[in-house]
Each structure stands twice: as C-alpha cells, then as structure tokens.
C-alpha cells in the first residue's frame, strides 16, 4: 500500500496536493471517499488528488482482506 | 468583497528579525493558501513560501536557509511572514496573496516596505 | 526548480500596435492536460494583478485584448490592440510545483 501511494503522490509536485492525497489514505470506515472528498474546499486539485488516493487505499486494502479470508487467516 | 490588508512599513538594523501581517477578510480564511512572495527595489518577484492555514502545513523557498517562517492565526484571520537574520539586500517590499484552487494568485496584499539599514 | 525565462525583457509599442511576450518554462508545467501557468500586470508601487490563469483564461475583469496562449514549456501573452494604460511589468509564473517561480518580467512601454 505504502509503495503504491508513494508511487502516485510523487507525481504531485505541489507540496499541498501531495499532502491531500496522502489524508486519502487515512482510514474512515464511516464515510465513502466521495462524502469525504465533498468536504474539501482547497480546490479541485486538492480533491482529485485525495480521491484517487483514498479510492487506490480502499481497494488495495479490500484486496488484502480479502486475501487474508482465502487464506483462512 | 475580498481584502488582504498588511502591516506597516518597518525600518530595521542587520541582524534583526521582522514580521509582517496579512489580515484577510471577505471569504473564509481556512479554505485557501496564503503565500509571501518579495520585490527588491527595481526587480523582479521572488516566492518565499507558503501556508495551508487550515491544516498549518508550510512550505519555503530553500534560497531563504531557514530565514523565514509563515505562521496563521484562525480566530483573527491574519498570517504572518517573519524574516530573520536580516541583511541589506533583504531591503524589499513584501506581499501576500491568496492563492485560489491551488492555482494562481487572485487577491494580493498592498505590500509592506522593509528596509534593513544601520 | 522550474526557470521561467521571459523575453524581451522590455518592449516599446505603438497604441494600437499588438505587443507579444514570451515565457518559457525549463521543464513542463503542465500536468495531466492542465497548464499551471500564470501572467500578471504590474504598475508602478501597485501588487501585480492577475491577468491570465491556467495559460489562456482570462481572469474577471481583465480586458478582452489580452489574450494567452501555450502549453507545456511554451507560453505566449498578446495584448492586441496595446493601449496607453498597458504599461506596465508583466510576469508569468508557474504553480505546477514547488517552488513556485515567477519570470524575470518585461517591461512594457508605450511609444
């Protein structure tokens, strides 16, 4: 997960951007990326970078869970 | 309508320290970067940073060597650019801005004259 | 850091004449088909005032007869027809990446 988020925030060369793609990662189990995305008022650059961020997090950890089930753990 | 009003000229020696303010009104302070930028006498502008103040993240131009440091206030509403270490060719006018959807600078301060003399 | 370098560095027009700076970028400033570059006007003891964002969009207010154009490293600002009110510095600036950096600036004279 680190390594792929590493991987899409270094394309960000707005220090501001990056950071807002790496609060995408934090886990909200309450809230879908998009509810949380709605809330940014930064700018639309902000929110693309948070949204892809969040969405890449969310699916790789759902990845990994599901894994985890597979192998009974 | 939108308005950065910044502080008042200020005269100090080699050395020394200033800070400079940038009240902000008319729209809500936490949802845009405020940046510093200078102007020496006859030249160009120079960026000397930034700050997010809603999250307080900062971000500085590394030609300034730990010199400057951006700071906000949320209940007032002001951020403020202290320089430190000063030298002659600190003599400048110093701005704020407004920067919008992370993208360009719409409202600017009037500037703030600092002039390092001893 | 992204130089920005701008040419002429001044210019003298005639009213009605169009007048044409140039800035260009030592690396790309765009970013997924999105041109993070900027000019601004300024005139004696004022703060620059936007002028153009994202390359050609011509912000609120500003006169139709200045006009942007470019992408990538290139970038073109026009002002066609130049009045007597033009004068003034004009810079360009990019917000790709940090550090933001401004060009050196073009003075703009009328004859």
């Known amino acids: 997960l680190q390594e792929k988020i590493e991987e899409i925030a270094a394309k960000y060369k707005h220090l501001v951007v990056k950071k807002c793609c790496y609060d995408g990662v934090r886990i909200n189990h309450d809230e879908t990326c998009e509810q949380r995305a709605a809330r940014i008022s930064v700018g639309p650059r902000c929110v693309k970078a948070f949204t892809e961020c969040c969405v890449v997090a969310s699916q790789l950890r759902a990845n990994n869970s599901h894994k985890d089930l597979q192998l009974g753990r | 309508q939108v308005q950065l009003v910044q502080s008042g000229a200020e005269v100090k020696k080699p050395g020394s320290s200033v800070k400079v303010s940038c009240k902000a009104s008319g729209y809500t302070f936490t949802d845009h970067i405020i940046h510093w930028m200078r102007q020496a006498p006859g030249q160009g502008l120079e960026w000397m940073g930034y700050?997010?103040?809603?999250?307080?993240?900062?971000n500085y131009n590394e030609n300034f060597k730990g010199r400057v440091t951006i700071t906000a206030d949320k209940s007032t509403s002001t951020a403020y650019m202290e320089l430190s270490s000063l030298r002659s060719e600190d003599t400048a006018v110093y701005y704020c801005?407004?920067?919008?959807?992370?993208?360009?600078?719409?409202?600017w301060g009037q500037g703030t004259t600092v002039t390092v003399s001893s | 850091d992204i130089v920005l370098t701008q040419s002429p560095a001044s210019l003298a027009v005639s009213p009605g004449q169009r007048a044409t700076i140039t800035c260009k970028a030592s690396q790309s400033v765009d970013f997924e088909g999105f041109n993070y570059m900027n000019w601004y006007q300024q005139k004696p003891g004022q703060p620059p005032k936007l002028l153009i964002y994202?390359?050609?969009n011509l912000d609120s207010g500003v006169p139709a007869r200045f006009s942007g154009s470019g992408s990538g490293t290139d970038f073109t600002l026009t002002i066609n027809p130049v009045e007597a009110e033009d004068t003034a510095n004009y810079y360009c600036q990019q917000s790709n990446e940090d550090p933001h950096t401004f060009g050196g600036g073009t003075k703009v004279e009328i004859k």
């Open positions: 994202a390359a050609s």
């Open positions: 801005a407004r920067e919008r959807n992370l993208e360009y600078f719409d409202y």
């Open positions: 700050i997010y103040p809603r999250e307080g993240w900062t």
